[in-house]
C-alpha cells in the first residue's frame, strides 16, 4: 500500500530536482573557473541535508548553513545588483554587464533559481506531489527559508554602492514584504555600503512621470537613510534602450536620456 503523504497547497518538487541541482553545479564550475574548488557532489549532499527527512514547515536558516559554507563567494565592491519583481530584466542586464552580479549569478542562487523542493518528516523521500505554500501553509518551508538565507548573506556581503532594480509598473514599486524589502534592505551593512542606488524601471512607452517621487520610494529612502546609507534614485524610462546602451555605449542615441 502507498504510504500516507501530507497534502500541501503548493506545487511539488520540480521533476529531476537532484539531477538538475547537480548539473547546474557542474555547469557553474565549468564557466566560473574560480569556483572549481567546489565539489558538486558535496554541494548536493549539503542541499539535500537541509530538507530531507525534516518536517517541511519547520525548516530553519541553520539547516542551510553547511550549503552556505560550501557556496561561499564574494562580489567585488560596487558590483551587487539586487532586484524586486523584475528578475528577467535584472538577469538580461548582468548577461550584458558581465562585471555585475545578481544573487542568481552566484552559485547558490543559480542552483535553486525557479526550482521547488521539499521532503517529508522521517523519510528519505523527496515530495514530488506537493510542497508547502508560503501563504496557505507556512513560511518556514524549504524554498522560502533557502531564499531568505541566501538573500540575507548576499546583502550582508555587499559593499560600496549597491544597485537595486525595481518594477515601476507595480502598485507598490517598493514592497516592504518582498525579499528585497523584508530581508536585503535590513541586512546591508552601513560600515561597508556607502549608498543604495535604485533604478526604477518604467513599463509604458509614454510614461514620463518621475517615479522616484513615488511614496513607496520615499519610504525606501527613509529606511535606508535611517541606516546611515545614502540613497539615490534613477528613472529608467526605456528599459529596451537601456539594455541596448549597456551593450553599445558608443551609440549616438545613448548620449541622450534613457
Amino acid at each position: 500500500l502507498p504510504r500516507w503523504r501530507q497534502q500541501w497547497s503548493g506545487s511539488g518538487t520540480t521533476s529531476r530536482f537532484p539531477e538538475t541541482v547537480l548539473a547546474r553545479c557542474v555547469k557553474y564550475t565549468e564557466v566560473h573557473p574560480e569556483m572549481r574548488h567546489v565539489d558538486c557532489q558535496s554541494v548536493w549532499d549539503a542541499f539535500k541535508g537541509a530538507f530531507i527527512s525534516k518536517y517541511p514547515c519547520n525548516i530553519t536558516e541553520e539547516d542551510y548553513q553547511p550549503l552556505v559554507k560550501l557556496g561561499t563567494q564574494t562580489v567585488p565592491c560596487n558590483k551587487t545588483l539586487l532586484w524586486s519583481r523584475i528578475k528577467d530584466l535584472a538577469h538580461q542586464f548582468t548577461q550584458v554587464q558581465r562585471d555585475m552580479f545578481t544573487l542568481e549569478d552566484m552559485l547558490l542562487g543559480y542552483l535553486a533559481d525557479d526550482l521547488t523542493w521539499c521532503g517529508e518528516f522521517n523519510t528519505f523521500e523527496i515530495n514530488y506531489q506537493s510542497c508547502p505554500d508560503w501563504r496557505k501553509d507556512c513560511s518556514n518551508n524549504p524554498v522560502s527559508v533557502f531564499w531568505k538565507t541566501v538573500s540575507r548573506r548576499f546583502a550582508e556581503t555587499a559593499c560600496g554602492v549597491v544597485h537595486v532594480m525595481l518594477n515601476g509598473s507595480r502598485s507598490k514599486i517598493f514592497d516592504k514584504n518582498s525579499t528585497f524589502g523584508s530581508v536585503e534592505v535590513h541586512n546591508l551593512q552601513p560600515e561597508k555600503v556607502q549608498a543604495l542606488e535604485a533604478w526604477v524601471i518604467h513599463g509604458g512607452r509614454e510614461d514620463s512621470r518621475d517615479l522616484c517621487q513615488d511614496p513607496t520610494i520615499k519610504e525606501l529612502e527613509s529606511i535606508i537613510s535611517k541606516r546611515n546609507i545614502r540613497f539615490f534614485c534613477k528613472n529608467i524610462y526605456r528599459p529596451d534602450k537601456f539594455l541596448q546602451c549597456v551593450k553599445n555605449p558608443e551609440d549616438s542615441s545613448c548620449l541622450s536620456g534613457i
Epitope: 529531476r16 539531477e19 548539473a23 547546474r24 555547469k27 565549468e30 573557473p33 548577461q95
Partner: antibody, heavy 120, light 107 residues
Framework: EVQLVQSGAEVKKPGATVKISCKVS????????MNWVQQAPGKGLEWMGW????????DVAEKFQGRVTITADTSTDTAYMELSSLRSEDTAVYYC?????????????WGQGTTVTVSS | DIQMTQSPSSLSASVGDRVTITCKAS??????VDWYQQKPGKAPKLLIY???NDYTGVPSRFSGSGSGTDFTFTISSLQPEDIATYYC?????????FGGGTKVEIK
C-alpha cells in the same frame, strides 16, 4: 549514448552569414554547457564560446565578439552558432563540444564537424 | 589570454618508440590541462584530462604529467594507429586555449 550531430557543409560568399546547428541526444540538453571550437585548414583548434542552454547565457571569445551569436532551442535539443560578416579566413571546420561530469573540464564529446568555405 | 606553447610541432618515430610531447603555459593553470588526439577528417578525441587522468577506454600507453606551467604527454610504445596530431588545451581560465599541435608520424 551521447551524440552531437552537426548540420552539413556550407559554401558562403564574403560578407554573408552562416548558421550551424548541433543536435544532441542521449542526455538532457539543459544539463550541460555547449562549446564551439574552430579549426582553420592546417591550423590548430580555437575555442569560440559557450552557451548554457537552460538560460541562454553565453560567453564568446574576444576574437569572435560582435560576429558570433550562440543560441539554443530547448524544444529541439539543438544548439546553434551563427557567424556573420564572413571573410576568407573564416574558412574552417566548426565543432560543437561538451564536457562530462567527473572528467575534468576537457571535451570528451564532439560533433562530427561542419565545414564552412568562404569564397567569392 | 593564456598561451600554450607546444613542442615539437612534428616528430617522426619508429613503432615501439617512446614519444614525448611538452606543453608550456604562459601562466599557472594548476593541473587543468587536457590532451587530445586528432586524425585527419575527424573530431579531436580526449585522451588525458586534468594533466594525468586517462579518459575512459584510452589505452594505457598514453599518459600525462605536470602541473603549474609545464606539462608532458607520453606515448610509451608508439603504435601505427597512433599516427595523428596531438593537442594540449588549458581549461583553467576562459578563454580555453590550445597548443599549436604536434604531428606524429612513423619512420
Amino acid at each position: 549514448e551521447v551524440q552531437l550531430v552537426q548540420s552539413g557543409a556550407e559554401v558562403k560568399k564574403p560578407g554573408a552569414t552562416v548558421k550551424i546547428s548541433c543536435k544532441v541526444s542521449g542526455y538532457t540538453f539543459t544539463d550541460s554547457v555547449m562549446n564551439w571550437v574552430q579549426q582553420a585548414p592546417g591550423k590548430g583548434l580555437e575555442w569560440m564560446g559557450w552557451i548554457d542552454p537552460e538560460y541562454g547565457r553565453t560567453d564568446v571569445a574576444e576574437k569572435f565578439q560582435g560576429r558570433v551569436t550562440i543560441t539554443a532551442d530547448t524544444s529541439t535539443d539543438t544548439a546553434y552558432m551563427e557567424l556573420s560578416s564572413l571573410r576568407s579566413e573564416d574558412t574552417a571546420v566548426y565543432y560543437c563540444a561538451r564536457t562530462k561530469y567527473n572528467s575534468g573540464y576537457g571535451f570528451p564529446y564532439w560533433g562530427q564537424g561542419t565545414t564552412v568555405t568562404v569564397s567569392s | 589570454d593564456i598561451q600554450m606553447t607546444q613542442s615539437p610541432s612534428s616528430l617522426s618515430a619508429s613503432v615501439g618508440d617512446r614519444v614525448t610531447i611538452t606543453c608550456k603555459a604562459s601562466q599557472n593553470v594548476d593541473s587543468d590541462v587536457d590532451w587530445y588526439q586528432q586524425k585527419p577528417g575527424k573530431a579531436p578525441k580526449l585522451l588525458i584530462y586534468k594533466a594525468s587522468n586517462d579518459y575512459t577506454g584510452v589505452p594505457s600507453r598514453f599518459s600525462g604529467s605536470g602541473s603549474g606551467t609545464d606539462f608532458t604527454f607520453t606515448i610509451s610504445s608508439l603504435q601505427p594507429e597512433d599516427i595523428a596530431t596531438y593537442y594540449c588545451m588549458q581549461s583553467n581560465t576562459h578563454p580555453r586555449t590550445f597548443g599549436g599541435g604536434t604531428k606524429v608520424e612513423i619512420k
